[in-house]
């Protein structure tokens, strides 16, 4: 029997990608392993090669189609299997019935830009990437601003409880360099999690006019 603590976690980006991480204590680093995807009601199946990401974990992306194609729906179930080569044969190490819309993690928001900046305020917009039209407006966002002398972990989270792809940051300090990040999450799905944070957007507030506070 398989020994050691195992974990097989996958997320669907809501369009055409399932990303998986397989970890097992005591597994051999040079073992060749794959993830196989078998949908219950579709004619395609897909495989990806698991590549090491740390001492005891491997990851891969199942590319189901072109980035914006809608390959799965809420009624689909995809049986995902981790298969590892043992000599001349393949051995199944893990299996799960994956419900894509219960396990969502969207791509990080993109195209962050400063719409307008003042001494104390900055208006920023962004776009969501490869998100299913099924969500309509059922998305939420979290944002954070990095102030000088602080870390991202210390930055307070701002929550936008609706599909709002802009924010107006207030009470900023004049002539100061900031960075901004945002992430997105669908409201749907028992095991759904936040997207990765966007690439940071750097901006600088305008200096205060001379003779004014």
């Amino acid at each position: 029997a398989v020994n050691g603590t195992s974990r097989f976690t996958c997320f669907y980006n809501s369009r055409a990608n399932i990303s998986c991480v397989w970890s097992q204590d005591g597994a051999l680093q040079d073992t060749s392993c794959q993830v196989h995807a078998w949908p219950d009601r579709r004619r395609w199946n897909q495989t990806c090669e698991l590549l090491p990401v740390s001492q005891a974990s491997w990851a891969c992306n199942l590319i189901l189609g072109t980035p914006d194609s809608q390959k799965l729906t809420a009624v689909d179930i995809v049986t995902l299997r981790v298969m590892c080569r043992e000599g001349v044969r393949w051995r199944m190490m893990a299996i799960q019935d994956f419900k894509p819309f219960e396990n969502l993690r969207l791509m990080a928001p993109i195209s962050l830009q400063v719409v307008h900046v003042e001494t104390h305020r900055c208006n920023i917009s962004w776009k969501i990437s490869q998100a299913s039209h099924y969500f309509e407006r059922h998305l939420e966002f979290e944002a954070r601003t990095l102030s000088p002398g602080h870390t991202w972990e210390e930055a307070p989270l701002m929550t936008l409880k609706q599909k709002q792809e802009w924010i107006c940051l207030e009470t900023l300090t004049p002539d100061t360099q900031y960075e901004f990040q945002v992430r997105v999450k669908p409201l749907q799905g028992e095991f759904t999690t936040w997207s990765p944070w966007s690439q940071p957007l750097a901006f600088r507030t305008k200096p205060a006019a001379l003779g004014k506070d």
Epitope: A1, V2, S6, M92, Q96, D97
Partner: nanobody, 125 residues
Framework: QVQLVESGGGLVQPGGSLRLSCAIS????????IGWVRQAPGKQREGVSC????????YYADSVKGRFTISKDSAKNTVYLQMTSLKPEDTAVYYC??????????????????WGLGTQVTVSS
């Protein structure tokens, strides 16, 4: 070689209950994903419930959710399927199955490595 022996089947009236048992020998229960799979006459095998090894997460087919409960007793190396509010459409041979892997599947019951011989459950008035 792992061996699975089911018991507890029988004839029960609609709305009644049964508890199926699956005794495992030749291996440790905690080393396997365990499932209950049923097959009605003239139909394909259907995953009913399963339990993932190591994290003991449980899964149920929509048709039995809220009525059936899978559990295990590691000391006795036995898995149970408590079936309540039974319906005529639950009539089938119920098989216990084990997979030498992390996790389990209801959708693809053919992925199990070891099978019991089955126990008949008949729901009829």
């Amino acid at each position: 070689q792992v061996q699975l022996v089911e018991s507890g089947g029988g004839l029960v009236q609609p709305g009644g209950s049964l508890r199926l048992s699956c005794a495992i020998s030749g291996g440790t229960l905690d080393s396997y994903g365990i499932g209950w799979v049923r097959q009605a006459p003239g139909k394909q095998r259907e995953g009913v419930s399963c339990m993932s090894r190591s994290d003991d997460r449980t899964y149920y087919a929509d048709s039995v959710k809220g009525r059936f409960t899978i559990s295990k007793d590691s000391a006795k190396n036995t898995v149970y399927l408590q079936m309540t509010s039974l319906k005529p459409e639950d009539t089938a041979v119920y098989y216990c199955a084990a997979v030498d892997a992390y996790g389990c599947s209801l959708v693809q019951p053919t992925t199990y490595d070891f099978w019991g011989l089955g126990t008949q459950v008949t729901v009829s008035s």
